[in-house]
Each structure stands twice: as structure tokens, then as C-alpha cells.
Interface confidence: medium
């Protein structure tokens, strides 16, 4: 039986002045960015709500956030797309200053949910901003996390040509199969349109000199992606900060030497 | 010369009424994202609306300005307004106007001198 | 909406000297925050946006860092127009932008 009182969830509630921030984000990435000013964010806000509104948090489908992500269709060019695992800060740092890659953070649909939590109430129009359910405590199918299951799945389908991935070296896992990027991104990967996957593993410590591309779950990485027939390549980041200052300024002379 | 320049404020009695305007020159108005952005005498900066680019079709506030201030713009004039209702004492301060860069990023790089606004009775 | 908090307040510095301002946020902004300079009765002047980025026509002497909630402001070496008032802004999570309180560099 599905609850009438207002539920009583484990996470925190949908972030404040919601409805503003999306809308508000939806005007300013249209009209920056050229390709997408046909776009109306008011229809992008009732495809967003149509989503979750009067549902029952813990029953949210890929199948309701389908008219969002028809309106929010964008293609990103061959060559240009960058995944990221746990070490988001830096990959949009990354993106940045490097504006001819994309993160889904840097695509509409990831600009306008980036940070932000939602869920609604089975059977009112109300948005709950007490509380919504938690992945691991209430529930996975919750809002939040079946968007970013979905829009995470329609962009790594999109990819083509050489895709990038930042992974984070200081973890005990740098490929976790549990992260949105090793089940969802990797196994949406399309082999006809994606010739390699390359990871670039972000060293943590200053005097980490060790080569992390060895590391079991990166040889575990490997498999998967070789077994789709997409071949896989790895680089060590050993110097995050130069790494961005490089980018920035690629003809400094210490740019030439290992980063 | 890209340049904005306020004009409209003035002294004005509680609950009166003042409309500001800021002159565009240099660049094309209408590709721009505009604010207001004011500082009351010896405080710091506080934002106060904003306007999308072309027709103005979505306009933003600040919660203490709500439901009072209404930005516009007119870019046939190359100007943008701010009409402000039912002035309180705490709305005394410099407005200036500020454009945004049109970039993927949303910072203000160019501001106009500013124009005073006194709310005193 | 998201609170920056400047620091210091006032930092009192001689000509020559480096100057270091910080800006920390209630919350992650990635890197959309945007330092301005502003001397008595003049209008804000940007500096730096995109946290690290130089407006144009800004001398090189002044430099952004950071990303996330901590961000910095650095002058390398003082010049007597440098003093002045400095406010970071963040254009991350908006309606409203928000701008810290300020901090004033004076001449020690």
C-alpha cells in the first residue's frame, strides 16, 4: 500500500528554490550556447516535474524522464566526450579550460540537475523539500538517481570516436564496477562508434610515482572494455595541478617534460 | 568604447516611487545578459535582478526586492530599467548596472558608474 | 542560497608585498567564481573569472586559484593602485548571485 501522509525519508529534502534554479539554469546554458537557443525551458521544467511530481519516490522509471530527455537531446562531437569517476571537481576544471570537451555536467541536462536533489509526493503536486529517499537507505529507484542512470546511459550511448575518463588514483577501487561510470557508462558504450576509451589516472600524492595503470581494477577495466571490442588505453596523471596549468598554457617549456 | 551609464536616482520618501535607467554603448545590447547590482553606503555589493538577452523574456530578483523592483529592457534604446515601487529605507544605495560576459561563464565585466537612491522621510 | 565568506577582513600590507585573499563557499560552486576589485567611489572592476581566469587588460601580477568551496586571491607583488577593496561572487547556483563581504587591503 503506497503512503497518503507525507513520508518520512532518510536523505535531505529537494534542494530550495528548485523549480527557480532549474528554470533559471535552463535560460542562462540556451542562451550561451548557440546550438540549443531553440529549446524552451518552460517545457523543459514540465518535462523535468513531469517526472517526479505525484509519483511515488521510490517508483521513478527511466520511462519518466524519456520527455525530458527528448527535449534535452544534444550531441557532443566525436573525440570530445569525458567520463569521470569520483574526481568530478577536477574533470570540470578540466572542461573548463579545455571548452571542446564535455562532461554530462557540461551538457544541459547534467547543467541543470548538477548538485541538486528532488523527489515529489505520491498524489500531491507538492515537491518534498523535508527529506527524499536515500539510494542505499530507502531506495535506488528514487528521482534522483534514475535521471543520472539516465542521462548518463544516453550520453556514453552518444560517444563516439575516442572517449576520455578521469579516475581517481587515490581511491582503493580506481575502477569501481559500482559507480555510475563502471555500470552504466561502460556498458553503454557503443563498439561500432567508439574506437577507444582512454583513462587518465589522477595521482593523489605529490610523491606518488607508482604506475596505477597496473592496478588490478584498471587490468579489470581493461577486460570489460576489450571484450565490447573497444580498445583501451591508460596514462598516468602524475601532477594534477600541472596537468590543468598545461592544459591552460600548453607551450610552457615544463609542459614538455611528464606530468 | 563599451560603456553603461546610470541615470534616474535620486531622494524619495518611504512607499515612493523611482525609476532607473542605464544607457548602453559599444557592444550589442541585445546578446547580453543585464543586472542591477547595488551597495548600500559603507556595505558591500548585493545583487539585485537580472534579465535574459533579446526580448528580456525571463527576468530574476533578489527575495527583498521581490514583488517591487521590475527590470526591463528596450533594445531599440539600447537601455535597460529598473522601475522601483514601494521604496524602504534599506533600498538606499548606489545601483549599478552590469553586464554579463557572454560567455560560458556568468561573471559581470563591465559596470556602469552608478546612480544614488535615498529613501528618507 | 550560497554564503561566501571572505577572509581576512582587512589585510594591512606594504608596497612590494604579497598579498593572499580568500573566499570560501557554503557550497560547491566548481569553479564559477569571479573576483572584482572596487576603490572608493568607483564601480567594481573584474579581475578574475572561472576562478583562475584573467579578465582582460588584468596585469598578470594578480592570479585566481582554487575550486569547490575554497578559492584565493593572489597579488605578487603590491602596487600603490592595488589598494583597494576586493569581493569574489559566485554565478554557480543562482537566482541570487551571490558576493562575499569583502576585504580590504590598506597600506600598512
Known amino acids: 500500500v503506497l503512503p497518503r501522509w507525507r513520508q518520512q525519508w532518510s536523505g535531505s529534502g529537494t534542494t530550495s528554490r528548485f523549480p527557480e534554479t532549474v528554470l533559471a539554469r535552463c535560460v542562462k546554458y540556451t542562451e550561451v550556447h548557440p546550438e540549443m537557443r531553440h529549446v524552451d525551458c518552460q517545457s523543459v521544467w514540465d518535462a523535468f516535474k513531469g517526472a517526479f511530481i505525484s509519483k511515488y519516490p521510490c517508483n521513478i522509471t527511466e520511462e519518466d524522464y524519456q520527455p525530458l530527455v527528448k527535449l534535452g537531446t544534444q550531441t557532443v562531437p566525436c573525440n570530445k566526450t569525458l567520463l569521470w569517476s569520483r574526481i568530478k571537481d577536477l574533470a570540470h576544471q578540466f572542461t573548463q579550460v579545455q571548452r571542446d570537451m564535455f562532461t554530462l555536467e557540461d551538457m544541459l541536462l547534467g547543467y541543470l540537475a548538477d548538485d541538486l536533489t528532488w523527489c515529489g509526493e505520491f498524489n500531491t503536486f507538492e515537491i518534498n523539500y523535508q527529506s527524499c529517499p536515500d539510494w542505499r537507505k530507502d531506495c535506488s529507484n528514487n528521482p534522483v538517481s534514475v535521471f543520472w542512470k539516465t542521462v548518463s546511459r544516453r550520453f556514453a550511448e552518444t560517444a563516439c570516436g575516442v572517449v576520455h575518463v578521469m579516475l581517481n588514483g587515490s581511491r582503493s577501487k580506481i575502477f569501481d564496477k559500482n559507480s555510475t561510470f563502471g555500470s552504466v557508462e561502460v556498458h553503454n558504450l557503443q563498439p561500432e562508434k567508439v574506437q577507444a576509451l582512454e583513462a587518465w589516472v589522477i595521482h593523489g600524492g605529490r610523491e606518488d610515482s607508482r604506475d596505477l595503470c597496473q592496478d588490478p581494477t584498471i587490468k579489470e577495466l581493461e577486460s570489460i572494455i576489450s571484450k565490447r571490442n573497444i580498445r583501451f588505453f591508460c596514462k598516468n596523471i602524475y601532477r594534477p595541478d600541472k596537468f590543468l596549468q598545461c592544459v591552460k598554457n600548453p607551450e610552457d617549456s615544463s609542459c614538455l617534460s611528464g606530468i | 568604447e563599451v560603456q553603461l551609464l546610470e541615470s534616474g536616482g535620486g531622494f524619495v520618501q518611504p512607499g515612493g516611487s523611482l525609476r532607473l535607467s542605464c544607457a548602453a554603448s559599444?557592444?550589442?545590447?541585445?546578446?547580453?545578459?543585464m543586472n542591477w547590482v547595488r551597495q548600500a553606503p559603507g556595505k558591500g555589493l548585493e545583487w539585485v535582478s537580472s534579465?535574459?538577452?533579446?526580448?528580456?523574456?525571463?527576468?530574476w530578483y533578489a527575495d527583498s526586492v521581490k514583488g517591487r523592483f521590475t527590470i526591463s529592457r528596450d533594445n531599440s534604446r539600447n537601455t535597460l530599467y529598473l522601475q522601483m515601487n514601494s521604496l524602504r529605507a534599506e533600498d538606499t544605495a548606489i545601483y549599478y548596472c552590469?553586464?554579463?560576459?557572454?560567455?560560458?561563464?556568468?561573471?559581470?565585466?563591465?559596470w556602469g558608474q552608478g546612480t544614488t537612491v535615498t529613501v528618507s522621510s | 542560497e550560497i554564503v561566501l565568506t571572505q577572509s581576512p577582513g582587512t589585510l594591512s600590507l606594504s608596497p612590494g608585498e604579497r598579498a593572499t585573499l580568500n573566499c570560501r563557499a557554503s557550497?560547491?560552486?566548481?569553479?564559477?567564481l569571479a573576483w572584482y576589485q572596487q576603490k572608493p567611489g568607483q564601480a567594481p572592476r573584474l579581475l578574475i573569472y572561472?576562478?583562475?581566469n584573467r579578465a582582460t587588460g588584468i596585469p598578470d601580477r594578480f592570479s585566481g586559484s582554487g575550486s569547490g568551496t575554497d578559492f584565493s586571491l593572489t597579488i605578487s607583488r603590491l602596487e600603490p593602485e592595488d589598494f583597494a577593496v576586493y569581493y569574489c561572487?559566485?554565478?554557480?547556483?543562482?537566482?541570487?548571485?551571490?558576493f562575499g563581504g569583502g576585504t580590504k587591503v590598506e597600506i600598512k
Open positions: 552590469a553586464r554579463e560576459m557572454n560567455t560560458y561563464s556568468f561573471p559581470m565585466d563591465v
Open positions: 559599444g557592444f550589442t545590447f541585445t546578446n547580453y545578459v
Open positions: 534579465i535574459s538577452i533579446s526580448g528580456g523574456r525571463y527576468t
Open positions: 557550497q560547491n560552486v566548481r569553479s564559477d
Open positions: 572561472d576562478a583562475s
Open positions: 561572487q559566485q554565478y554557480y547556483d543562482w537566482p541570487p548571485y551571490t
